[in-house]
């Protein structure tokens, strides 16, 4: 409703690429949801730029994002989670670029945690377990998990296993003996909600036993 930029500023702004991406996190803080957006070009001058979301909200027509360094976010209970919202990059009242987005299709789960590996000597296997906050959530409850592990010396040779539970058994014979392994896990929505992989959990490190010379099995 008032002037924010000189015409020259706006003309310069229109030459820039204001492509952006967003992800939502539902019930990330109690019953609060969050929406995070960022420019795809890290060199965009964000000084006078704001993000605004309109539509598919409760109580208010539009909400302004909060800016923290180079990311923009909202934390609120007021997402309707039905229908599409319009997310715009704005200079004052002028919209530079907008996207219509259903927040249920850009969900990024929280990272799994408490990853651990226990060796079962009698069964000759390793039981991998981890936890996820999504088991307690009302909305994004069903996830697909991606467990990735590698021998520590193999920089980029990750083995991936997809599963819907939070427990995985790795057979001892599939792993190298007397080796140090790194393992980590991430999650993605798998039912109704769509979106992106979570961040990886912190890595867990475990060592496989040596081969028992007499039987050819690991100790």
């Amino acid at each position: 409703e008032s002037g924010y930029a000189q015409n020259g500023d706006l003309e310069d702004a229109e030459l820039d690429d204001y492509s952006f991406s967003c992800y939502s996190q539902l019930e990330v803080n109690g019953s609060q949801h969050s929406l995070t957006c960022a420019f795809e070009d890290p060199d965009v001058n964000t000084t006078n730029l704001e993000f605004e979301i309109c539509g598919a909200l409760v109580e208010v027509k539009c909400l302004n994002f909060r800016k923290l360094q180079e990311i923009y976010f909202i934390e609120t209970k007021k997402f309707l989670l039905i229908g599409k919202s319009n997310i715009c990059v704005k200079v004052g009242e002028k919209s530079l670029t907008c996207k219509k987005i259903d927040l249920t299709t850009i969900v990024k789960p929280e990272a799994p945690f408490d990853l651990s590996v226990i060796y079962r000597e009698g069964a000759n296997d390793f039981v991998v377990t981890f936890n996820t906050s999504h088991l307690q959530k009302k909305y994004v409850k069903v996830l697909m998990h991606d467990v990735a592990y590698r021998q520590e010396k193999d920089e980029n040779k990750w083995t991936h296993v997809n599963l819907s539970s939070t427990k995985l058994t790795l057979l001892q014979r599939k792993l190298q003996p007397a080796a140090m392994y790194e393992i980590k896990v991430r999650s993605i929505p798998d039912h109704y909600f769509k979106g992106f992989w979570s961040e990886w959990s912190p890595s867990y490190y475990f060592r496989t036993p040596e081969i028992n010379n007499s039987s050819g099995e690991m100790d």
Epitope: E50, E59, L63, N64, R66, K67, I74, K90, G92
Partner: antibody, heavy 122, light 107 residues
Framework: QVQLVESGGGLVKPGGSLRLSCAVS????????MAWIRQAPGKGLEWVST????????YYPDSVKGRFTISRDNAKNSLYLQMNSLRAEDTAVYYC???????????????WGQGTLVTVSS | DIQMTQSPSSLSASVGDRVTITCRTS??????LAWYQQKPGKAPKLLLY???TLHIGVPSRFSGSGSGTDYTLTISSLQPEDFATYYC?????????FGGGTKVEIK
Amino acid sequence: QVQLVESGGGLVKPGGSLRLSCAVSGFTLSDYYMAWIRQAPGKGLEWVSTISASGLRTYYPDSVKGRFTISRDNAKNSLYLQMNSLRAEDTAVYYCARPLSAHYGFNYFDYWGQGTLVTVSS
Amino acid sequence: DIQMTQSPSSLSASVGDRVTITCRTSEDIYQGLAWYQQKPGKAPKLLLYSANTLHIGVPSRFSGSGSGTDYTLTISSLQPEDFATYYCQQYYDYPLAFGGGTKVEIK
């Protein structure tokens, strides 16, 4: 504790100008949208202006648009209302008000100043 | 712009009475409604927001309800300190708007 203290009111002739200030304390001004709301003598409440937390967006009703300008100086913990081309119908107590919720733009107000009286009369 | 119609403009009631004030908006405000109490010479005080959420420190005899375009403030048992003027306010969209007020007087 949260405090909002308005100043700058007084008697002014029609067509004149006045600048109201609101000194705030007890919270981080830069986290909040802020607003001015007025009340003519014996009348109801009327919203006058809102400024976003960043100060980049300002909002006005048609009754004051083009005549009033809201601004803020977060470093000085101050909110301002510059009023130009004043009319008799602008006579009112002017309150500055802070929303309950920080950021985003939920405009319901839990903290109000004591008000400053602006009288526009020849 | 969203128009606000608050009724009644005034009412007389006795201590202990149940009092109901209504606010109607010209379009759906999706529960973006607040209620305030104001006493003479004082700034307004926030009572409720989100149409039905009681602000911290407000007595539980105050309650709010409604959705769409029709909203209600109820005082279940009027107390001496409740004689005041009450305003509704929509914050769904700009321009923000207040109802005309309801003056609650002693019968």
